[in-house]
């Protein structure tokens, strides 16, 4: 679709005559007819096929005509058409005169005609003008034409339709060939496809419009990159959605069982070493100096009388000293100047001679101590209550004050929590110093093992050959994905052997 | 109102030529085409070839050209045909109609002229 | 040259009844949407008179009674009501390309 352009510029009729060679009366006041054909060898009769168009009276005698309009008719004067422009046409332009203001042929004397041009040729579509002039006996004609497509219509014959448009169907404006230009933040075919943020994961993200990066389930982030671990993962990360890896010291279907404790809680004071003894179970050993389950009591180094023989005890930055009573000397005093001579066993002690009188020992009555008998019995220097109990003399004997959670008589024994049985679903009870904690088996998840989850199929290790296993949380199943050479449900018998069966 | 008159009838010999003119008026002569065609006795129609009086520009049918000659004459509103080298099937009625680029067709026709070869 | 076959070559009609002549070219003579076909009237001792231009449109003072159809190749001239001023022959022509052909002629008669 296009139009065939035609603009008159001057006319030329010197002498005002018609074309029979009378004169018009007063003037020949000038109309033109327009018709345009296909092309033809030489110009024949017959039916305007690419259009017509007539104008008003535009001038009398000789004239030049306006650019935009006159008259209320347009030049230049549109013919439109709408097929493919062939690039060939034949153009026949009349001049008549119009002694009146009635221009229809019937109208108009029977001699009317003023003079009459054919032109035929070529004429690709463009925007420039191609200049022409006409002269006959009496007339001369000044013109020029060009085909230019319609709206929307492109391409050297106009055939090529294109329409912009910035909506569902499409983004884009037409180049002068009439292909499509896709706007910014479009691409495809008919920039119907949104250019995703930059960036976006090509198979985890996707967009509705430019610079955009939605996520399909399972993916995150900015760019859809990192994936979405299982609903209530605690302590791991995945690397396929809804998996939940855990981070090292951490176990379970969910990975929030503590499998290290002593790097997760540093529960061990003073610079003691801490040894994982199970879940949420550690020990401490103590540096000396230092008791208390977590090593949190400072020990007087005196506190286990080193001195002997009544020696007294100094505690000391780097240590402790022993000041020796008379008769005695040694780091503990344990060396001795005495003999049994010198009646040197208190409390009642009896004395027994050694290595030929050369030394001595004493024998204690009940409730006194030391190698001179001069101590009276303290049951808890030795420290016997274990997990940081106090001990306490009680006369003749000794008692432990315990910690909470513990019990028996050196409270080396836990408060059993888990006597009442409280881990649902066969849940394993372990005592812990505050409290009790279940461990769940596969399916069950909570703090007592009550919640039912998903099964991690895959914790088994259920696959063969390195074969990577993907759980199936909606049927609780896993899936073995053989690596190559290696088949069956958990790729347990290599490519070209049969596997034996029992029959 | 428009009118289109031939010339009279006319006997020719074999090998003679024959010039048949059509008068034109009530119109402007100049913007149309004159045709020409014949009707042999008894037969159809045969379209000869026609003339741009505007320019002259002529169109033929090839079965008759090299024989035929068309001319015009604006300042009289005449067209003329010329037929020569005559043979005995040359004997036929001649019409001249006018014609124009608006389609309308041949649409006014002269009474037509006999032309008779004959030895 | 483009052959105008027409059919029939006569046509006998009663008065006032329908009378339908068919014309079809040896190859399309529609060109930019146009069919160029024109049909004529020639009753004897008279020049031809254009009844129909462009297939289907009617000449200046042509009775509505003379309508043409068709496009391409087939085309048909219509007498809705033949009356006694009808008898004529009819000729199809074409103008789509050099040399203009006409058909053979339908004569039409009264039964």
């Known amino acids: 679709s296009g139009v065939f352009q035609l603009q008159l510029q001057e006319f030329i009729n010197e002498r005002g005559v018609l074309a029979s060679g009378r004169p018009c009366e007063p003037g020949c006041r000038t109309f033109f007819r327009v018709c345009l054909k296909h092309f033809q060898a030489v110009v024949s009769p017959g039916p305007c096929t690419f259009g017509t168009v007539s104008t008003p009276v535009l001038g009398t005698n000789s004239f030049a005509v306006r650019d935009d309009s006159s008259g209320g008719g347009r030049n230049p004067l549109q013919l439109p058409f709408n097929f493919t422009w062939p690039g060939t046409f034949s153009l026949i332009i009349e001049a008549w005169h119009a002694p009146g203001d009635d221009l229809r042929p019937e109208a108009l004397p029977p001699d009317a005609l003023i003079s009459k041009i054919a032109i035929q040729g070529s004429l690709a579509v463009g925007q420039n003008w191609l200049l022409d002039e006409q002269t006959s006996t009496l007339t001369r004609l000044r013109y020029s034409y060009r085909v230019i497509c319609s709206d929307n219509y492109y391409g050297d014959n106009c055939s090529r339709l294109c329409k912009k448009r910035n909506d569902h169907f499409g983004h884009y404006v037409c180049q002068p060939d009439g292909n499509l230009s896709c706007l910014p933040g479009w691409t495809g075919e008919y920039c119907q496809q949104p250019i995703c943020l930059s960036g976006c994961h090509e198979q985890n993200g996707y967009c509705s419009k430019p610079a955009e990066c939605l996520c399909r389930p399972g993916w995150q982030g900015r760019l859809c990159n990192e994936c979405i671990p299982h609903n209530g993962c605690r302590h791991g990360t995945c690397s396929t959605p809804w998996q939940c890896t855990c981070d090292e010291g951490w176990g379970g279907l969910f990975c929030d069982q503590d499998l290290n404790y002593c790097t997760h809680h540093s529960p061990c004071k003073n610079g003691a070493t801490c040894s994982n003894s199970g879940q949420r179970s550690y020990t401490c050993t103590c540096r000396p100096g230092y008791t208390g389950v977590d090593c949190e009591l400072e020990l007087s180094e005196c506190d286990s009388n080193p001195c002997r023989n009544g020696g007294s005890c100094k505690d000391q930055e780097d240590g402790y000293h022993c000041l020796c009573p008379p008769g005695y000397y040694g780091l503990h005093c344990e060396h001795s100047t005495l003999s049994c001579a010198d009646s040197p066993c208190f409390n009642g002690g009896s004395c027994r001679e050694r290595n030929q009188g050369a030394n001595y020992a004493c024998e204690c009555p009940p409730n006194f101590t030391g190698s001179n008998c001069e101590k009276k019995v303290d049951r808890c220097t030795s420290n016997p209550c274990a997990n940081g109990g106090q001990c306490l003399n009680r006369g003749p004997s000794r008692m432990c004050r315990c910690r909470p959670g513990f019990t028996g008589t050196y409270c080396e024994l836990h408060v059993s929590d888990c006597a009442r049985n409280p881990c649902a679903h066969g849940g394993t009870c372990h005592d812990l110093e505050n409290g009790l904690m279940c461990t769940c088996p596969a399916g069950f998840s909570g703090r007592r093992c009550e919640v039912r989850t998903s099964i991690d199929a895959c914790a088994s290790s259920p696959c063969f050959n390195r074969a990577t296993c993907y759980t199936d949380l909606s049927t609780d199943t896993f899936v073995c994905n053989c690596p190559y050479g290696f088949v069956g449900s958990r790729c347990e018998f290599p490519v070209g052997l049969p596997p034996s069966f029992p029959w | 109102q428009v009118q289109l008159v031939q010339s009279g009838a006319e006997v020719k010999k074999p090998g003679a030529s024959v010039k048949i003119s059509c008068k034109a008026s009530?119109?402007?002569?100049?913007?149309?085409?004159i045709h020409w065609v014949k009707q042999a006795p008894g037969q159809g129609l045969e379209w000869i070839g026609y003339i741009a009086n505007y320019n002259r520009a002529t169109n033929y049918n090839q079965k008759f050209k090299g024989r035929v000659t068309f001319t015009t004459d604006t300042s009289t509103s005449t067209a003329y045909m010329e037929l020569r080298s005559l043979r005995s099937d040359d004997t036929a009625v001649y019409y001249c109609?006018?014609?124009?680029?608006?389609?309308?067709?041949?649409?006014?026709w002269g009474q037509g002229t006999l032309v008779t070869v004959s030895s | 040259d483009i052959v105008m076959t027409q059919s029939p070559d006569s046509l006998a009609v009663s008065l006032g009844e329908r009378a339908t002549i068919s014309c079809r070219a040896s190859?399309?003579?529609?060109?930019?949407?146009?069919?160029?076909m024109k049909w004529f009237q020639q009753k004897p001792g008279q020049p031809p008179k254009l009844l129909i231009y462009?297939?289907?449109n009617q000449g200046s003072g042509v009775p509505d009674r003379f309508s043409g159809s068709g496009s391409g190749t087939d085309f048909t001239l219509t007498i809705s009501s033949l009356q006694a001023e009808d008898v004529a022959v009819y000729y199809c022509q074409q103008s789509k390309e050099v040399p203009w052909t006409f058909g053979g002629g339908t004569k039409v008669e009264i039964k």
């Open positions: 462009a297939a289907s």
């Open positions: 109609a006018r014609d124009y680029d608006y389609d309308v067709g041949m649409d006014y």
């Open positions: 009530g119109y402007s002569f100049t913007a149309y085409y």
């Open positions: 190859e399309s003579v529609d060109n930019y949407g146009i069919s160029f």
